[in-house]
Interface confidence: low
């Protein structure tokens, strides 16, 4: 108990909790927040901010807590059963295909366009054409003509769990 | 350059109270859990403390715990360690050093300088 | 709290040696094993991190091996600037624990 951590954010029966509870596995498998002892006899709790496991499981180790990269903001810390919850800062979006980096939403839209959709956590501006309504993605190459406009508020948490 | 330097050592009594500034240059502070060790005169290393990036997760030493305080200014690019009832077993050189690519799995990189604390009466 | 036990203490080599020196850890730390190295009166300098992943501007002749608890550091060819104490330090879990050291002296 000689690690015990000293988390500010939380409750104060949660700061108090040993680092390591042992039990017993229930067929074989131990409860999330926990891991299963080399012999397979116990059931071994993670530690808080440390690592993790979600799911009923009989792993040898917990899963190592996520440290949110430069460009985010934690929206939510490491718990022995949930792994840290990340999300890009404000003005910066993270897309499907390049999950590793959060990327930086365009300003505006090339001209002929209108912005419909604000910059998320998880996209970026959407921009129609004025005529047609054709969706694109704020992306625009260099040379465009943009109009600025601010980015918007993001309206729900966007979770990386890496 | 990334670079680290301490500050805030001096002769100090023992009972006596003492805060160490670690002053970071060179990235970007706010990203980085940080930490201090300590090395007492022709010893080896010992861990003292560790703080995340946003101060939400802080760890000690069983053998500073409740007398040192660390903590962190983003704002700043600044680390303290606020260190009370000093014992002449805390006499040592204090690092300041950077935490690694995790929160959890960390290593220490790169060092300051150290600022040399001493408890005597 | 997981013991970090160094060996041997010092080690008296000559400059193109081949020098190997041994961490073992108490516990299992997987690959979460860090090697320093310190001179006289200078901060430690980070050589190894993750067991065997050679810091950026360490010279190859450095190389880290090792998994579970039994790790090794070995200076291929000695240089005379790699005279200098060795540390191993465990990232595994708090708190964070080094070796006692490992001074490489000339013989």
């Known amino acids: 108990e000689s690690a015990l951590i000293t988390q500010q954010d939380l409750a104060p029966q949660q700061r108090a909790a040993p680092q390591q509870k042992r039990s017993s596995p229930s067929e074989g498998l131990c409860p999330p927040g926990h891991h299963i002892s080399e012999d397979g006899r116990d059931c071994i709790s993670c530690k808080y901010g440390q690592d993790y496991s979600t799911h009923w499981n009989d792993l040898l180790f917990c899963l190592r807590c996520t440290r949110c990269d430069s460009g985010e903001v934690e929206l939510s810390p490491c718990t022995t059963t949930r792994n840290t919850v990340c999300q890009c800062e404000e003005g910066t979006f993270r897309e499907e295909d390049s999950p590793e980096m959060c990327r930086k939403c365009r300003t505006g839209c090339p001209r002929g366009m209108v912005k419909v959709g604000d910059c998320t956590p998880w996209s970026d501006i959407e921009c129609v054409h004025k005529e047609s309504g054709t969706k694109h993605s704020g992306e625009v190459p260099a040379v465009e003509e943009t109009v600025t406009s601010s980015p918007g508020t993001p309206a729900s948490p966007c979770s990386l769990s890496g | 350059e990334v670079q680290v330097v301490e500050s805030g050592g001096g002769l100090v009594k023992p009972g006596g109270s003492l805060r160490l500034s670690c002053a970071a240059s060179g990235f970007t502070f706010s990203s980085y859990s940080m930490n201090w060790v300590r090395q007492a005169p022709g010893k080896g290393l010992e861990w003292v403390s560790s703080?995340?990036?946003?101060?939400?997760?802080?760890y000690y030493a069983d053998s500073v715990k409740g007398r040192f305080t660390i903590s962190r200014d983003n704002a700043k690019n600044s680390l303290y360690l606020q260190m009370n009832s000093l014992r002449a077993e805390d006499t040592a050189v204090y690092y300041c050093?950077?935490?690694?690519?995790?929160?959890?799995?960390?290593?220490?990189?790169?060092w300051g300088q150290g600022t040399l604390v001493t408890v005597s009466s | 709290d997981i013991q970090m036990t160094q060996s041997p203490s010092s080690v008296s080599a000559s400059v193109g040696d081949r020098v190997t020196i041994t961490c073992r850890a108490s516990?299992?730390?997987?690959?979460?094993l860090v090697w320093y190295q310190q001179k006289p009166g200078k901060a430690p300098k980070l050589l190894i991190y993750a067991a065997s992943s050679l810091q950026s501007g360490v010279p190859s002749r450095f190389s880290g091996s090792g998994s579970g608890t039994d790790f090794t550091l070995t200076i291929s060819s000695l240089q005379p600037e790699d005279f200098a104490t060795y540390y191993c330090q465990q990232a595994n879990s708090f708190p964070f624990t080094f070796g006692g050291g490992t001074k490489v002296e000339i013989k």
């Open positions: 703080i995340s990036s946003s101060s939400s997760y802080i």
């Open positions: 516990q299992g730390i997987s690959s979460w």
């Open positions: 050093a950077r935490g690694g690519s995790s929160w959890y799995g960390d290593w220490f990189d790169p």
